[in-house]
């Protein structure tokens, strides 16, 4: 799978994680930090 960094405009998209662009799927994806979940890593779980 080819990945690259998201466009600059997506800098604040992932609240607690890193935004990566999945080139083959044409999708932005939030790779969440440990303890966070959700489309934008907005939910904390214990």
């Amino acid at each position: 799978v080819s990945i690259t960094k998201c466009n600059s405009d997506m800098n604040g998209y992932c609240l607690h994680g890193q935004c990566i662009y999945l080139v083959d799927m044409s999708q932005n994806y939030c790779r969440c930090e440990v303890g966070y979940t959700g489309v934008r890593c907005e939910h904390f779980y214990l």
Epitope: N7, D9, G12, L15, S26, Y29
Partner: antibody
Amino acid sequence: QDQLVQSGAEVKNPGASVKVSCKASGFNIKDTYIQWVRQAPGQGLEWMGRIDPLRRQTKYREKFEGRVTITADTSTNTAYMELSSLRSEDTAVYYCVRSGREFDFWGQGTLVTVSS
Amino acid sequence: DIQMTQSPSSLSASVGDRVTITCRASQDIHKYIAWYQQKPGQAPRLLIQYTSTLQPGVPSRFSGSGSGTDYTFTISSLQPEDIATYYCLQYDNLRTFGGGTKVEIK
């Protein structure tokens, strides 16, 4: 399936304000950004600004700064674009556009006519 | 704001011709450019995103290329149904549309 349904056509007097709504279904606007784009008759496409409904953060094109206000109501899954001090040059079709995880998905457009 | 200079503003070509449209950005947009087709009275239709990724259902005669500040959109063999206005859009840093290219049949 995913939809963005915009409010109906409006006719406004010069100097008035207009507020266009954009109701999302099939997805949560908090997972997206909502952009606004307009197109005057016979003219090109023009990006106006956008809102991040989750953070409640807005960014506007410089030329619209102070005259446009983009808001979102996450409880009704609806975004709004209000343009004030209308002039004849603001006559255009206004589109809301979803961006975020996937690339842009457009509403059907709302015609705003400014005429005395 | 990033500026997008699209050329030509209009062109006339024959059916079967190769048609090329260019967009130049005022700064590096890291391949974050999309191409739209718009026919009169219709909303814009997305053809290509991320420089060269064709949308599902879009004919393979449409293609895109480029990097840095210079990008190209090509119709390899113009068809009557391709008569429309085409716009580039940079979406690296906020959004800016090119001025559009009106494509007509000669």
